[in-house]
């Protein structure tokens, strides 16, 4: 057993038929010694009495909220929430494997830049009674300073017959240093409770593999005079760490038909423009990575050709 | 041609050797074993390699102050990695294949390397660690580690010299 | 074309050594590891060992230590297998190959130990 | 030393059968599995690399699966030229080992 927070404490169990359980000890928060009772929850039975409560946990049942009291006033509370271990392995009922980039990714982050600002998502199909909380920080053994805000409701998506609920945090490294080599990863720890359950999930990653620009801005068009070509011309996105000297962007540019079937034409290029065919009802994109290390590309910016 | 007594190196040689170095490292990458072996010894293996860090210079106005420093723990690097690749880890049991870029790679660490500190010019470098793994699939890990961390290094030495090409040439 | 062309059959008395060339051709000799294999008549594969042409380091199955003997001549691009205090269990086929991945294999060389 | 164990020893097929080789190892090798045909009177040919990866040249009917001590080698529709030996080999450790084989005949 330990605290998660305040008057609230995790119950490790191994999770099988007939599990002998875990025996917790309560002790009311007081200086009273005599008359303490206690209860579960809005049950009015009473389920011993003393400053000590001695308690067998093995089921949802045995957690919740337990209140012990003298005369009617209540003197202290402690929140038993169950972490459960089925064959070696906690569970993960909370939130829905995403499966990218691999099996068994329940969070996943993005980088607009290398400024140590990033953005984690997690996705579940619980709506109600669920809460969840971020930590993250650079290293483990040491660790610097990463500041998270509160998770939000982000999305609301239907999935067949299920609603899917979106929720993301954003993150800022304390002393982010964009020009660096990262040497050590950043960690990231959400503790996800819903009802009587307690769940944690983590993710480790350097802020270079995360990274995802934003897709280039002004992307324009300028027919060149008796040619079927035009020159496509844009920006770097306003969110992209700078100098663009030295963060420096590459880019693709593909001419894509209105049928999907339609072979696309693309162009690679470091230049913030291009020359390409212009054809009838197509419609040309460009997107951006990080010119030195191979990590997402952006989303496309797109204009017609017409 | 380089860097002797602190003069300026040929930005934009350096810059496209440093650009070349990025791609052949990219390239190395998937073809030194396979893909998924992130999960296999979580330990360290790969501690020891040289970071270019906050304090190096490596950054713009760093560089604009007095990129010594920073050219200088490049070098490092470029000498570390260009022995780690020429080790037993990478010409040891399984052999790379015979398209591997690896050997490319190695030769390309060598030539920035030398572009940075002509000859008679000496700064000192980092003792490489004596990783000698024994089995094959050690070695498969720590190829797959050492790219990797190389791929970062190179990105960092990369946006330098691009950087340096454009604003710190004559 | 990466060939591997292995001596001619043996045949020998029991106490005696033979030494069976596996000489490269179609590749540079010095960037690929040269593995033995032996095959014992109707049976499965036994990995003997490889040599790193490159600096002459052979690494031996324990098994065939001080049985077998890997040498290579870079300028003749060949590797070379001794074996000494020959047996009837030594009796086999005896294949070099390049590592697994790259998968060139000599035609085998026959030994023979008999009376 | 790991030791690779392969069943079944023979295996009896019409042309057109799918059929499944089985190959497991003492010790978790993860996927540093390579598998090999040897016809009668040739040298042994590499099918697959790393348990799962094909290798050019080899038809597409070859296919592995398999990780840490369990792994299989499929052929989905077998040919009368398929006949001849199947070894798996471990590629984690050395000494490199292999199976005793798996000799496949055409009924």
């Known amino acids: 057993i330990w605290e998660l927070k305040k008057d609230v404490y995790v119950v490790e169990l191994d999770w099988y038929p007939d599990a002998p359980g875990e025996m917790v000890v309560l002790t009311c928060d007081t200086p009273e010694e005599d008359g303490i009772t206690w209860t579960l929850d809005q049950s009015s039975e009473v389920l011993g009495s003393g400053k000590t409560l001695t308690i067998q946990v093995k089921e949802f049942g045995d957690a919740g909220q337990y209140t012990c009291h003298k005369g009617g006033e209540v003197l202290s509370h402690s929140l038993l929430l169950l972490h459960k271990k089925e064959d070696g392995i906690w569970s993960t009922d909370i939130l829905k494997d995403q499966k990218e980039p691999k099996n068994k990714t329940f969070l996943r982050c993005e980088a607009k830049n290398y400024s140590g600002r990033f953005t984690c998502w997690w996705l579940t199909t619980i709506s109600t009674d669920l809460t969840f909380s971020v930590k993250s920080s650079r290293g483990s053994s040491d660790p610097q300073g990463v500041t998270c805000g509160a998770a939000t409701l982000s999305a609301e998506r239907v999935r067949g017959d299920n609603k899917e609920y979106e929720y993301s945090v954003e993150c800022q490294e304390d002393s982010a240093c964009p020009a660096a080599e990262e040497s050590l990863p950043i960690e990231v720890m959400v503790d996800a409770v819903h009802k009587l359950k307690y769940e944690n999930y983590t993710s480790s990653f350097f802020i270079r593999d995360i990274i995802k620009p934003d897709p280039p801005k002004n992307l324009q068009l300028k027919p060149l005079k008796n040619s079927r070509q035009v020159e496509v011309s844009w920006e770097y996105p306003d969110t992209w760490s700078t100098p663009h000297s030295y963060f420096s962007l590459t880019f693709c540019v593909q001419v894509q038909g209105k049928s999907k079937r339609e072979k696309k034409d693309r162009v690679f290029t470091d230049k913030t423009s291009a020359t390409v065919i212009c054809r009838k009802n197509a419609s040309i994109s460009v997107r951006a990575q990080d010119r030195y290390y191979s990590s997402s590309w952006s989303e496309w910016a797109s204009v017609p050709c017409s | 041609r380089a860097v002797p007594g602190g003069s300026s190196p040929a930005w934009t040689q350096c810059q496209q050797l440093s650009q070349k170095l990025c791609t052949l490292a990219w390239s190395a990458h998937p073809l030194v074993g396979h893909m998924d072996l992130r999960e296999e010894g979580d330990e360290e293996t790969t501690n020891d390699v040289p970071h270019i860090q906050c304090g190096d210079g490596c950054d713009p106005q760093g560089l604009r102050d007095n990129s010594q420093f920073c050219l200088q723990r490049i070098h490092q690097g470029l000498i570390f990695y260009e022995k780690l690749l020429g080790s037993d880890i990478f010409t040891g049991e399984p052999s790379l294949l015979p398209d591997s870029p690896v050997g490319q790679l190695h030769a390309s660490l060598l030539g920035l390397s030398q572009l940075l500190q002509p000859e008679g010019h000496h700064w000192e470098t980092q003792q490489i660690p004596s990783l000698s793994p024994s089995q094959p699939w050690q070695r498969l890990l720590l190829r797959f580690k050492i790219l990797r961390s190389l791929q970062a290094f190179v990105a960092v030495a990369a946006r330098v010299f691009a950087h340096g090409a454009a604003t710190l040439s004559p | 074309e990466v060939q591997l062309q292995q001596s001619g059959p043996e045949l020998v008395k029991p106490g005696a050594s033979v030494k069976m060339s596996c000489k490269a051709s179609?590749?540079?000799?010095?960037?690929?590891?040269m593995h033995w294999v032996k095959q014992s008549h109707g049976k499965s594969l036994e990995w003997i060992g490889y040599?790193?042409?490159?600096?002459?380091?052979?690494n031996y199955n324990q098994k065939f230590k001080g049985k077998a003997t890997l040498t290579v001549n870079k300028s003749s691009s060949t590797a070379y297998m001794e074996l000494r205090s020959l047996t009837s269990e030594d009796s086999a086929v005896f294949y070099c190959?390049?590592?697994?991945?790259?998968?060139?294999w000599g035609q085998g060389t026959t030994l023979s130990v008999s009376s | 030393d790991i030791v690779m164990t392969q069943s079944p020893a023979t295996l009896s097929v019409t042309p057109g059968d799918r059929v499944s080789l089985s190959c497991r190892a003492s010790?978790?090798?993860?996927?540093?599995l390579y598998w090999y045909q040897q016809k009668s009177h040739e040298s042994p040919r590499l099918l697959i690399k790393?348990?799962?990866q094909s290798i050019s040249g080899i038809p597409s009917r070859f296919s592995g699966s398999g990780s840490g001590s369990d792994f299989t080698l499929s052929i989905n529709s077998v040919e009368p030229e398929d006949v001849g030996v199947y070894y798996c080999?471990?590629?984690?450790?050395?000494?490199?080992?292999f199976g005793g084989g798996t000799k496949l005949e055409i009924k």
């Open positions: 190959a390049l590592n697994w991945d790259l998968d060139y």
């Open positions: 179609g590749y540079t000799f010095t960037a690929y590891n």
């Open positions: 040599i790193n042409p490159n600096n002459g380091i052979p």
């Open positions: 010790q978790s090798i993860r996927d540093y």
């Open positions: 790393f348990a799962s």
């Open positions: 080999q471990n590629g984690h450790s050395f000494p490199y080992t």
